[in-house]
Interface confidence: low
């Protein structure tokens, strides 16, 4: 009678009660031995790394039957030692052993390369009992072998705390070559040598390599794997692959593109992110990098005014981020801006030029030639000045701000006056007699208030005393003050 059982996660007793399909009705063992506590039969297949093979061994039981007849040593029967088969084929192998019926709870486990195969569905144990011994055949099957199934398989049985190990069964799965290293895409300098590597393995060995460039074989004679192809240089893009051949056939690697480094394409989408009176923040999208990383970029700026001398300002910056603040520009001016970037090969063409304008700013200089004098008859102080140079107004003048501070013993009072843009003189009332009046003037645009002029002081006497001499600030570069009376 035959009993076939898929292994479960508990020890399978040799005789679990009356034996199904058996003619015998009583299978009480002569001697009951406890099985190794917690020992689990493990019959799941799971690929592992190759390890060292196990040689078979035997257990010599010390137990004797009631008749005291010594038992023979237990050992697995010899079986096929080496199986060679093609990938995706099915394989079944087994190990068998005859065990005296005095032993109970015997389990067989499968091991591959030193690791137990847990939870498999490929392992079946069959029992063939007779009067004195039970023949046990443990079969292991793989429906579609893969390379990872290569290795050394053994059976183990535990009896009376002894371990019996079968001779190894070596499984060798042969198939098409398998790439362990394929060529990789590269960016190379024109006419410069470079290497490509290709490596493939069997079994079966040897594996021979042919190189292919743009669909044509490079080498007439194959090279044994691994192979390094030295390409003396290219002038244009090429696609390389390698063919790996063994007795089972041929495998072709992925095709890799070898690009020739070139100057980059010009940047695109140059745009204005922010404008102030003296700076413009720009961003751009880099063009194609020519298969070589961008190193830096150049921002070219020229005045868009047709009357300008056409000179170009150049600002260099790193390639990242794609953003640059152009500084030291004139207020309320129009500029043409272009961007060019470089890689190790050279500079790109300039991007399409864009037009940008700076905003209005506060004036950068104070009014010039400020003159102050007392008009005692009307009890006023007259103030006169010259407007700042147009270039330094940084916008359209909307007026002037006058600060006048009156100081006498223990009193200090500051007043502010605003005057329109057309004036270059102002009259303020005397606030305090027998005091010093300090005057400063600043130009004003929509962009803000500019710097105040240097202070000009005048003494305001008590009533009845006249000072005809005005106070003033000199114009830059003039030795003598220009007095406007």
């Amino acid at each position: 009678a035959i009993t076939e059982a898929r292994e479960e996660a508990k020890p399978y007793p040799l005789f679990p009660g009356p034996f199904p399909g058996s003619l015998q009705t009583d299978h009480t063992p002569l001697l009951s031995l406890p099985h190794a506590s917690g020992y689990q039969p493990a019959l799941m297949f799971s690929p592992t790394q190759p390890g060292r093979p196990h040689t078979g061994n035997v257990a010599i039981p010390q137990v004797t039957s009631v008749e005291s007849k010594p038992l023979p040593p237990l050992a697995f029967k010899h079986t096929v030692g080496h199986i060679i088969l093609s990938e995706h084929k099915g394989v079944k192998f087994n190990c068998s052993i005859s065990v005296p019926n005095i032993y109970q709870d015997t389990t067989i486990s499968w091991w591959k390369d030193g690791k137990e195969l847990l939870g498999a569905h490929h392992a079946i144990t069959q029992f063939y009992p007779d009067d004195e011994v039970t023949a046990i055949i443990a079969s292991f099957s793989i429906t579609s072998v893969q390379r990872s199934d290569n290795g050394s398989y053994i059976c183990k049985m535990k009896i009376n705390n002894e371990e019996i190990v079968s001779d190894p069964i070596y499984i060798e799965v042969q198939g098409l070559p398998h790439f362990t290293k394929q060529p990789e895409s590269m960016n190379v300098t024109r006419n410069t040598a470079f290497n490509l590597t290709c490596q493939a393995v069997g079994p079966p060995e040897p594996v021979n390599i042919f190189w292919v460039q743009n669909s044509s074989r490079v080498n007439e004679q194959p090279e044994k794997s691994p192979s390094v192809l030295t390409v003396p240089g290219l002038t244009e893009m090429a696609v390389f692959s390698c063919e790996a051949h063994n007795d089972k056939g041929l495998t072709v690697s992925k095709g890799v593109q070898i690009n020739i480094k070139a100057i980059p394409s010009p940047p695109t989408e140059v745009s204005i992110r922010n404008s102030t009176a003296h700076s413009i923040l720009i961003s751009w999208v880099p063009g194609f990098d020519g298969y070589s990383p961008f190193r830096n970029c150049s921002i070219q700026v020229k005045e868009a005014d047709p009357l300008s001398n056409g000179s170009v300002m150049i600002f260099n910056t790193s390639a990242l981020p794609h953003l640059y603040q152009i500084k030291q520009l004139q207020a309320l001016a129009n500029y043409s801006i272009g961007v060019s970037c470089m890689n190790e090969i050279g500079w790109s063409a300039v991007s399409p030029w864009i037009l940008a304008s700076t905003t209005e700013g506060a004036p950068s200089v104070a009014p010039l030639n400020v003159t102050v004098f007392l008009n005692e008859s009307s009890d006023n102080v007259d103030i006169r000045w010259m407007k700042p140079p147009t270039k330094q107004q940084d916008g359209e003048l909307v007026g002037y701000r006058i600060s006048h501070v009156w100081q006498s013993a223990g009193i200090s009072k500051e007043l502010l006056e605003e005057v329109g843009q057309n004036g270059s003189r102002a009259r303020i009332s005397v606030q305090v007699h027998n005091a010093t009046c300090t005057v400063r003037i600043a130009a004003v645009t929509r962009g803000g208030v500019g710097p105040f002029s240097d202070p000009v002081k005048i003494f305001i006497p008590a009533h009845g005393w006249v000072d005809y001499a005005p106070s003033s600030t000199p114009a830059p570069g003039n030795a003598d003050p220009v007095l406007i009376i």
């Epitope: 593109q257 992110r273 922010n274 961003s283 999208v285 990383p293 981020p321 794609h322 953003l323």
Partner: antibody, heavy 120, light 108 residues
Framework: QVQLVQSGAEVKKPGASVKVSCKAS????????INWVRQAPGQGLEWIGW????????KYNEKFKGRATLAVDTSTSTAYMELRSLRSDDTAVYFC?????????????WGQGTTVTVSS | EIVLTQSPDFQSVTPKEKVTITCSAS???????FHWYQQKPDQSPKLLIY???NLASGVPSRFSGSGSGTDYTLTINSLEAEDAATYYC?????????FGQGTKLEIK
């Protein structure tokens, strides 16, 4: 540490609009772009657009142009994404992310996401 | 629009295994513009690798990236249980910015 905290989940009817907020902290808000990315249930990531908080400069995925509006409030370091004319296929988790000036690069910080459900 | 195609869509692997995810672009991209993200269930994506091969802050050294032209690879050496996630590639070469469809990694 850098944090992007988004507003809570929203349920909307088809045709309606939704406005999701993203409050940034732990860095200078105006120095980095805020990008918006969405992820439909069980799907991949889809970029909507970016805004540069310093000047409000925006760039949109053509697919969302006209329906999505990105905005910022620099006084509160908050970015907003409004999506109009909602359809059922706009049901997704919407993420705000931080990107350097150099807006064509990677997103180094992400908000926790805001689930928007569009259902009649 | 640059289309990124990841392979495989799904992979079930055991701990300690080496995992390779590839991302193929519809046109050539400089390695500066190529990045990888990790997204665990019910979490926001997290920057994993930027500019092809640079590990983002706090990312374990078992992660690495390589590639050029149109083909880019994310490799995880000796997978750990915490690496179960969906991985996305992303290009920053041109607008619209695009992502791969994702590769879901399951730990057996």
């Amino acid at each position: 540490q850098v944090q992007l905290v988004q507003s809570g989940a929203e349920v909307k009817k088809p045709g309606a609009s939704v406005k999701v907020s993203c409050k940034a902290s732990g860095y200078t808000f105006t120095t980095y772009d805020i990008n918006w990315v969405r992820q439909a249930p069980g799907q991949g990531l889809e970029w909507i657009g970016w805004i540069y908080p310093r000047d409000g400069y925006t760039k949109y995925n053509e697919k969302f142009k006209g329906r999505a509006t990105l905005a910022v409030d620099t006084s509160t370091s908050t970015a907003y994404m409004e999506l109009r004319s909602l359809r059922s296929d706009d049901t997704a988790v919407y993420f705000c992310t931080r990107g350097y000036y150099d807006n064509l690069y990677y997103f180094d910080y992400w908000g926790q996401g805001t689930t928007v459900t569009v259902s009649s | 629009e640059i289309v990124l195609t990841q392979s495989p869509d799904f992979q079930s692997v055991t701990p300690k295994e080496k995992v390779t995810i590839t991302c193929s672009a519809s046109s050539i991209i400089s390695s500066n513009y190529f990045h990888w993200y990790q997204q665990k269930p019910d979490q926001s994506p997290k920057l994993l690798i930027y500019r092809t091969s640079n590990l983002a802050s706090g990312v374990p050294s078992r992660f690495s990236g390589s590639g050029s032209g149109t083909d880019y690879t994310l490799t995880i050496n000796s997978l750990e249980a915490e690496d179960a996630a969906t991985y996305y590639c992303q290009q920053g070469r041109s607008v619209p910015l695009t992502f791969g469809q994702g590769t879901k990694l399951e730990i057996k």
